[in-house]
């Protein structure tokens, strides 16, 4: 699987999950998030050669087409597969609130 | 929606579904498919600027991060959203068989 366990341990050029730290205030301008100050959102990147973690029949077909037609511009793209939530602390005035934000952290990637 | 209705009618540079005709024999080397000879598989391509048909909170966050950090290499990618099946005819010996291949045709795209 193209997940953090594999990708963070290997120098993988092809489609894999990459570490990306985002600071809420500096990178997004979100002043309302109190804790954490930032988090590892991660992202997916790298080429999708034929049959690499293909998501659907279409991506397999497209990968094969691309292999047999190297001049073609159509090829699958490396995108998130599994995402996890992030728990944050914010304030409503002076009152602290805890919220779970869905689909915030990329754990693995696929070729789609 | 970034679907065939919109994308095929507009000269859209950003993420959109593009027409792609695949000939089973010539492009894939699939001699076993009798009918059709080929089909419009289509594909997704084009930049994913901030907020364009974002798939998840993560892709929105990544788009925002990319906008505020233009030097960043992390950005969402244009990939299939809705896929449709394709019905094919093939032969097992002299016996014709009809099969529906799932997820063969891209109908719309998203930034993921």
């Amino acid at each position: 699987a193209l997940d953090t366990n594999y990708c963070f341990r290997n120098l993988e050029e092809n489609c894999c999950v990459r570490p990306l730290y985002i600071d809420f205030r500096q990178d997004l301008g979100w002043k309302w998030v109190h804790e954490p100050k930032g988090y590892y959102a991660n992202f997916c990147s790298g080429p999708c050669p034929y049959l690499r973690s293909a998501d659907t029949t279409h991506s397999t077909v497209l990968g094969l087409y691309n292999t047999l037609n190297p001049e073609a511009s159509a090829s699958p793209c490396c995108v998130p597969q599994d995402l996890e939530p992030l728990t944050i602390l914010y304030y409503v005035g002076r009152t602290p609130k805890v919220e779970q934000l869905s689909n915030m952290v990329v754990k693995s990637c696929k070729c789609s | 929606a970034l679907d065939t209705n919109y994308c095929f009618r507009n000269l859209e540079e950003n993420c959109c579904v593009r027409p792609l005709y695949i000939d089973f024999r010539q492009d894939l080397g699939w001699k076993w498919v009798h009918e059709p000879k080929g089909y419009y598989a289509n594909f997704c391509s084009g930049p994913c600027p901030y907020l364009r048909s974002a798939d998840t909170t993560h892709s929105t966050v990544l788009g925002l991060y990319n906008t505020l950090n233009p030097e960043a290499s992390a950005s969402p990618c244009c990939v299939p959203q809705d896929l449709e099946p394709l019905t094919i005819l093939y032969y097992v010996g002299r016996t014709p068989k009809v099969e529906q291949l799932s997820n063969m045709v891209v109908k719309s795209c998203k930034c993921s």
Partner: antibody, heavy 120, light 108 residues
């Protein structure tokens, strides 16, 4: 230049609903919290609630809970305020405003206001 | 909810004079959860002061805010003709956000 442009005036019957829009331009919409404030004719200001775009966390004044819904559409940088079960006392100018960044905060940019008249 | 009481209800002064507007909260707001706005007829409110004493961008330095706890003051050191309007204080320490009833500053 930051601008919040609201939809036009509305005349509504008692018991019906109204949905007012507020389109942002000139700044990063999803980095800000948007609040809604209303002002009855000749009266003071009354906060209704606010929303954090992207994550769609909304916070409402207790007296409007169940009657007001504030949403954000990031793709168009637009916030909506829908008020249901309208009564004559809801006749007011409705303003959207961006806060300085917190959920409850001072409001630095305001829309031009939308007059909602509730009359039978 | 926190009730804000502004005084006086109406203040009649002449250009060049000093204006002192008061805002009292029904419970302590600490030192940084109060804002002041100016509103002219037919216009949206305009933020003057936030955090009790910080001037918003573009606001002339004749406007100043002070106070903490339950008592806050907006001072206009030297009134200009364009300063005559209604002034509101706002608290954002607790939900719901509340506003004072306003002080009308009129030309004497």
């Amino acid at each position: 230049q930051v601008q919040l442009v609201q939809s036009g005036a509305e005349v509504k019957k008692p018991g019906s609903s109204v949905k007012v829009s507020c389109k942002a331009s000139g700044y990063t919409f999803v980095s800000n919290v948007i609040s809604w404030v209303r002002q009855a004719p000749g009266q003071g200001l009354e906060w209704m609630g606010g929303v954090i775009p992207i994550v769609d966390i909304a916070n409402y004044a207790q007296r409007f809970k169940g009657r007001v819904t504030i949403t954000a559409d990031e793709s168009t940088s637009t916030t909506y305020m829908e008020l249901s079960s309208l009564r004559s006392e809801d006749t007011a100018v409705y303003y959207c405003a961006s806060t300085l960044g917190l959920v409850l905060d001072a409001m630095d940019y305001w829309g031009q206001g939308t007059l909602v008249t509730v009359s039978s | 909810e926190t009730v804000l009481t502004q005084s006086p209800g109406t203040l009649s002064l002449s250009p060049g004079e000093r204006a002192t507007l008061s805002c009292r909260a029904s419970q302590s707001l600490g030192s940084s959860y109060l804002a002041w706005y100016q509103q002219k007829p037919g216009q949206a409110p305009r933020l003057l002061i936030y955090g009790a004493s910080s001037r918003a961008p573009g606001i002339p330095d004749r406007f100043s805010g002070s106070g903490s706890g339950t008592d806050f003051t907006l001072t206009i050191s030297r009134l200009e003709p364009e300063d005559f309007a209604v002034y509101y204080c706002q608290q954002y320490a607790d939900s719901p956000i509340t506003f004072g009833q306003g002080t009308r500053l009129e030309i004497k």
